[in-house]
Amino acid sequence: VPPGEDSKDVAAPHRQPLTSSERIDKQIRYILDGISALRKETCNKSNMCESSKEALAENNLNLPKMAEKDGCFQSGFNEETCLVKIITGLLEFEVYLEYLQNRFESSEEQARAVQMSTKVLIQFLQKKAKNLDAITTPDPTTNASLLTKLQAQNQWLQDMTTHLILRSFKEFLQSSLRALRQM
């Protein structure tokens, strides 16, 4: 490889292009890397990561979560139902990812990257889904008022909300990745 050239780029023409499933898989892993980086800043900044008061704040957040009925677990696995749940869940997370945008100092770009990568992931998954009619898009007005409400919280609650969003999004993506690998 010539100096200064990346061997991956040189080999690229001989590499098989990624399949749709591989692209989705890689995208989820990329987002999870981003979430982990954001959590480092959150945990360094406050003691939220060790907090046992999570349950209190969690009650006020309606964060998407995988349940048995969603068809993503192996017992009762249903590819179409599960795919709809993953897309719907990601669309519901978008307002929370918007909330995160002003929550980071040194990781501002990382927060933006997580948000934009999630939009791309949704597009990848929508191409894969056959039953797009079953996907309900969150109401913009409801999202706007939720955003205002979250931003009006005191500092402690905002820190806790940030922590909970990142943790829940991570778990949702992990569940999604396990399910997508079964498809």
Epitope: I28, R29, L32, S36, R39, C43, C49, E50, M66, F73, Q74, S75, F77, R167, K170, E171, Q174, S175, L177, R178, R181, Q182
Partner: antibody, heavy 127, light 111 residues
Amino acid sequence: EVQLQESGPGLVKPSQTLSLTCTVSGGSIATSYYAWSWIRQPPGKGLEWMGVIDYDGDTYYKPSLKSRTSISRDTSKNQFSLQLSSVTPEDTAVYYCARAGLGDSYYLGTYYAMDYWGKGTLVTVSS
Amino acid sequence: QAVLTQPPSMSGTLGKTLTISCNGTSSDIGSGNYVSWYQQLPGTTPKLLIEGVTTRVSGIPDRFSGSKSDNTASLTISGLQSEDEATYYCASYRETNNVVFGGGTHLTVLG
């Protein structure tokens, strides 16, 4: 070479809290996507997974032990700890700490493969 | 009470092949390629042999192999040797965010 070493009291009274610490050497618990687990083995019996703390500091516990178990970490000391409250003689066991997280485990949240183990420490619950 | 079911004991003959089964459900073994196998020699710490159902860990001889069919995982030991006499445990990821072990199989190697 990663090495793990459990430490803590060998005797705990019933109803008290069992506290164990695992010190990791040969690698930092704060780098790379590994997770850190606790497993126990009652005398003459099989292995029982108790819980795990992952790279981000998130904890997951065996459902039947969840109300009594707490796992935490201290990255500055390269240690992670187990606390088990309201112990009974049935909690008498050899307690192992172990590293998990091979391959894609972090991305999948599947910490089922433990590649490095401590030697184990026997904890007896008795008055 | 272990969640995954293994035969408590088995015996095999030197040089022969033996397979240990590990039965679970669609929530654990059936949920993906998330099965591992451990060997515990008497009085020692468990040692990881196999992860990801079939992947042998570095340094483990190729006499040990893993497989899975539906909700059952298997560990096959070919060319049995006297040093294989140990207790073998299977483990699996279990939905959600959980790990379960089998009860263990004590293997006796007969001359």
